[in-house]
């Protein structure tokens, strides 16, 4: 008789999840000499230990602490790029501007990027059928808690000027419910972080509006300044040209506003 299995509203664990995590870990540690000491089997064991045999709606940050410890990594604290709802451009940017880092450029972020995972209470099985959805099921699910934990630690490590890339095409350019708005903003340390600089990325080719005047950006400014962190906002009118100018800053067309 097949055992009854909880049906969740979200997609199930990404297929070949253990193999993917292990392979990513090996690849990352080969590319990044400073992480060569990492034992990828131990990393996978710690990752698995965070959610296997646990109720997928009852995961805590504490569950991920062994993994956090193994994945401890020092990135230059003044070279951090946060993003919200514009991951691809942020990643394209750090691929060109190699001295800047998104969370997904760190080992732990790289391991979990675009993956889904969950287990089941009291069994060692991974649930490939369904996993809890943050809204419809529960917020304390393995994926959400993981990203909350690593995002908090990433923000806490930041210093000097922190940049954030925001999607100017969305109705809420700054969304208080995003990971950036609910976790990272509140974990920047005013003693270390002087300024948060927002880059608002325009979508339309003819969009010449000053999106730094958007009410949600002013809301972000208010939250940040109340935390004794200074705020700066810049429009990136032409993201394609922006990336091109990061690649070739000497290009004569790169002196004008992008």
């Amino acid at each position: 008789v097949p055992r009854w299995r909880q049906q969740w509203s979200g997609p199930g664990t990404t297929k070949r999840f253990p193999e993917t995590v292990l392979a990513r870990c090996v690849k990352y540690t080969e590319i990044h000499p400073e992480m060569r000491h990492v034992d990828c089997q131990s990393v996978w064991d710690a990752f698995k230990g965070a959610f296997i045999s646990k109720h997928p709606c009852n995961i805590t940050e504490e569950d991920y602490q062994p993994l956090m410890k193994l994945g401890t990594q020092t990135v230059p604290c003044n070279k951090i790029l946060l993003w919200s709802r514009i991951k691809d451009l942020a990643h394209q940017f750090t691929q060109v501007q190699r001295d800047m880092f998104t969370l997904e450029d760190t080992l732990l972020g790289y391991l979990a990027d675009d993956l889904t995972w969950c287990g089941e209470f009291n069994t060692s099985k991974i649930n490939y059928q369904s996993c809890p959805d943050w809204r419809k099921d529960c917020s304390n699910n393995p994926v959400s808690v993981f990203w909350k934990t690593v995002s908090r630690r990433f923000a806490e490590a930041a210093c000097d000027v922190v940049h954030v890339m925001l999607n100017g095409s969305r109705s809420k350019i700054f969304d208080k419910n995003s990971t950036f708005g609910s976790v990272e903003v509140h974990n920047l340390q005013p003693e270390k972080v002087q300024t948060l600089e927002a880059w608002v990325i325009h979508g339309g080719r003819e969009d010449s509006r000053d999106l730094c005047q958007d009410p949600t950006i002013k809301e972000l400014e208010s939250i940040i300044s109340k935390r004794n962190i200074q705020f700066s906002c810049k429009n990136i009118y032409r993201p394609d040209k922006f990336l091109q100018c990061v690649k070739n800053p000497e290009d004569s067309s790169c002196t004008s506003e992008i």
Epitope: D160, E191, T195, C212, Q230, F231, S232
Partner: antibody
Framework: QVQLVESGGGVVQPGRSLRLSCAVS????????VHWVRQAPGKGLEWVAV???????DYSAAFMSRFTISKDNSKNTVYLQMNSLRAEDTAVYYC?????????????WGQGTLVTVSS | DIQMTQSPSSLSASVGDRVTITCKSS??????LAWYQQKPGKAPKLLIY???SLETGVPSRFSGSGSGTDFTLTISSLQPEDVATYYC?????????FGQGTKVEIK
């Protein structure tokens, strides 16, 4: 280029009022904050107030009850209304632009306007 | 209010000398410190922000160091055009407060 020009200074009797203006060009008041800083003759710098791009304000407690900072974005002008003036308010008053959207230090200053409070 | 104390209040040095001005805050201001230069009869000019960051266009002979409560402005090789009064300013807390100034002259 970025410029700030103060006006409205002059000789005023104690107890009277004066309104200083700071006309800005080369940047928008909807993007940057503007501070007022004063300097008594032969003395150091003293911060008075700031008005941020959204119109919110912060004051030094020493001036909060007598001075009011305001702005008119359409006229690209920031104002400092000074009431109940005293002899010790005699100073050069500078307006200055914040370097970024909302920061507490300034990169471009006006040339200053002298206010003399004397009977 | 946070008190900012500069020393010395004035100094005289020769062209080419290394000049150091110190600024102490009455409480921890982390790295929220700016340095300004004011020439006689002129408005102040921003030199350094964030305790160590050189403002664009400022000669590289100027540098800032320190964090917490003790800060230093250094002119590595004094030039005649550096004759001015130098002010530190904290921006950790309102009211913003300035040091009393250090007057730099050429011997």
């Amino acid at each position: 280029q970025v410029q700030l020009v103060e006006s409205g200074g002059g000789v005023v009797q104690p107890g009277r009022s004066l309104r200083l203006s700071c006309a800005v060009s080369g940047f928008s008041l909807t993007n940057y904050g503007v501070h007022w800083v004063r300097q008594a003759p032969g003395k150091g710098l003293e911060w008075v107030a700031v008005i941020w791009r959204g119109g919110s304000t912060d004051y030094s407690a020493a001036f909060m009850s007598r001075f009011t900072i305001s702005k008119d974005n359409s006229k690209n002008t920031v104002y400092l209304q000074m009431n109940s003036l005293r002899a010790e308010d005699t100073a050069v008053y500078y307006c200055a632009k914040t370097t970024l959207t909302r920061v507490w230090y300034v990169d471009v200053w006006g040339q200053g306007t002298l206010v003399t409070v004397s009977s | 209010d946070i008190q900012m104390t500069q020393s010395p209040s004035s100094l005289s040095a020769s062209v080419g000398d290394r000049v150091t001005i110190t600024c102490k805050s009455s409480e921890d201001i982390y790295n929220r410190l700016a340095w300004y230069q004011q020439k006689p009869g002129k408005a102040p000019k921003l030199l350094i922000y964030g305790a160590t960051s050189l403002e664009t266009g400022v000669p590289s002979r100027f540098s800032g160091s320190g964090s917490g409560t003790d800060f230093t402005l250094t002119i590595s090789s004094l030039q005649p055009e550096d004759v001015a009064t130098y002010y530190c300013q904290q921006y950790w807390n309102t009211p913003l407060t300035f040091g009393q100034g250090t007057k730099v002259e050429i011997k």
